[in-house]
């Protein structure tokens, strides 16, 4: 199983601060529910990096749901969560900055951003709110951050994990920072199954950040994320690599699932996302 | 100065095809997208689509999808906006609208064409 | 498709009194994608709000915006004679752009 053969490196904690999540759900999406009570509630936007409100139904839903703006912080944030270094070294645009606008295979039409390489600067696009390209934004500052050059021609990087909107998904961005950062797994490991909007039952598979593995689901055959995958070892090659577990003394380590005997204590209340 | 100038009023009947124009000028026609937004007498605003003229890129009201056809001249800077297979609730006073690439502040409009349509 | 309605249909106000318009959508908008339109009769809308609260080139102070989620309001603290007119909210956050019926302010 190519599950067992894959490790992580050892990172440790003297490294630039990377986007902390105290816990994996507070990477999920604002989920109100099918119920149609209009409770204000609060959860964490990882695009904004803050505790925001929003409308919850009243049930069902999801754990990124919060009855006060203060439990939500508690939860979710921590004091350097926000730092964002950037640099003045000239960089390359990441590659998918030159993708077409992509709108899709659904029809959940959104308003998104995009870098228009033609007219070299970011522009709004309709999505149809599933797939398509990483070219994608759901903030036009997040589309200039990474895609636009900065004053005088530089690229502005961001050393912090950039946020891209992608279905509600933590997205490093490929910059040529020393490979000691790089996180190698795309930024919809960290996002929740999504059945989708459709009635099929498909079987597919998707990576479960919290426990470390590809674990089958039910696909409904549109709609949906990206963290959804036709076989397990596409799911693992995808996923496995990136993902970095915090153990609870300190350090950050992936377990060797081959030796079966051999147990290490997760601390999973802290998940690092490293920037690539 | 901006300015965006549309073609008179029509009187069609109904499943007849319109076809309206919006001269644009003082601006770069081509750095904006153009709506086509029509009113209802004593209605609200509908929206029926938007196109970009340096690279035709169109998003149509599903609504008006089938019976909508924007275009552009980019020689002319003129948009274009096509409504077939008229009906009497088609009635209504039609604008051109123009709004940056990065959303849809609708910050200048032409002066409406009023499109009459019975039979 | 997002639909926005707009309450009351008719304000009948005195100048100088406060009004408070009302917007409601039928699903959640990011206070990013919601502006407000101004129409007098005859003429074409002018944009008055964007983004909520930022107030469109030369509108006087005395209009506000705020909300979030599925309710917005466009308040005037106290009328002036040129205040009367049909204003519309208009949201842009989903596909297609859709805008709510207006409010016609009108004088007692």
């Known amino acids: 199983d190519s599950e067992e053969d894959e490790e992580h490196t050892i990172i440790t904690d003297t490294e630039l601060p990377p986007l902390k999540l105290m816990h994996s759900f507070c990477a999920f999406k604002a989920d109100d529910g099918p119920c149609k009570a209009i409770m204000k509630r609060f959860f964490f936007n990882i695009f904004t990096r803050q505790c925001e409100e929003f409308i919850y139904g009243g049930c069902e839903g999801n754990q990124n749901r919060f009855e006060s703006l203060e439990e939500c912080k508690k939860m979710c944030t921590r004091d350097n969560a926000n730092r964002i270094i950037k640099t003045t070294l000239q960089q390359e645009k990441p590659d998918f900055c030159f993708l077409e606008e992509d709108p899709g295979i659904c029809r959940g039409y959104i308003t998104r951003y995009f870098y228009n390489n033609q007219t070299k600067q970011c522009e709004r696009f309709k999505y149809g709110g599933c797939l398509g390209n990483m070219n994608n934004f759901e903030t036009l500052e997040e589309c200039k951050n990474i895609c636009e050059d900065g004053p005088n021609g530089f690229q502005v990087d961001n050393y912090g994990t950039q946020l891209n909107a992608v279905n509600n998904s933590l997205t490093p961005q490929s910059t040529k920072v020393p490979s000691l950062f790089e996180f190698h797994g795309p930024s919809w490991c960290l996002t929740p199954a999504d059945r989708g909007l459709c009635r099929a039952n498909e079987n597919r598979f998707y990576y479960n950040s919290v426990i470390g593995k590809c674990r089958p689901f039910k696909y409904s055959g549109c709609g949906g994320n990206e963290n959804n995958f036709t076989s397990k070892q596409e799911c693992l090659r995808a996923c496995k690599k990136g993902f970095i577990q915090r153990i609870s003394k300190g350090g950050l380590i992936k377990t060797k699932r081959k030796r079966k005997k051999q147990r290490v204590k997760i601390a999973y209340e802290e998940i690092f996302v490293k920037n690539m | 100065e901006v300015q965006l100038v549309q073609s008179g009023a029509e009187l069609k009947k109904p499943g007849a095809s319109v076809k309206l124009s919006c001269k644009a000028s003082?601006?770069?026609?081509?750095?904006?997208?153009m709506h086509w937004v029509r009113q209802a007498p004593g209605q609200g605003l509908e929206w029926i689509g938007e196109?970009?003229?340096?690279?035709?890129?169109?998003n149509y009201n599903e609504k008006f999808k089938t019976r909508a056809t924007l275009t552009a001249d980019k020689s002319t800077s003129t948009a274009y906006m096509e409504l077939s297979s008229l009906r009497s609730e088609d009635t209504a006073v039609y604008y051109c609208?123009?709004?940056?690439?990065?959303?849809?502040?609708?910050?200048?409009w032409g002066q409406g064409t009023t499109v009459t349509v019975s039979s | 498709e997002i639909v926005l309605t707009q309450s009351p249909a008719t304000l009948s106000l005195s100048p100088g009194e406060r009004a408070t318009l009302s917007c409601s959508a039928s699903s959640s908008v990011s206070s990013s994608y919601l502006y407000w339109y101004q129409q007098k009769p005859g003429q074409a809308p002018r944009l008055w709000i964007s983004g909520t609260s930022i107030l469109a080139s030369g509108v006087p102070a005395r209009f506000s915006g705020s909300g979030s989620g599925t309710k917005y309001t466009l308040t005037i603290s106290s009328l002036e004679p040129e205040d009367f007119a049909v204003y519309f909210c208009h949201q842009w956050s989903h596909y297609p752009f859709t805008f709510g019926q207006g409010t016609k302010l009108e004088i007692k």
């Open positions: 196109i970009k003229p340096d690279q035709g890129r169109i």
């Open positions: 003082g601006y770069t026609f081509t750095s904006y997208w």
């Open positions: 609208a123009r709004s940056s690439v990065v959303d849809t502040a609708m910050d200048y």
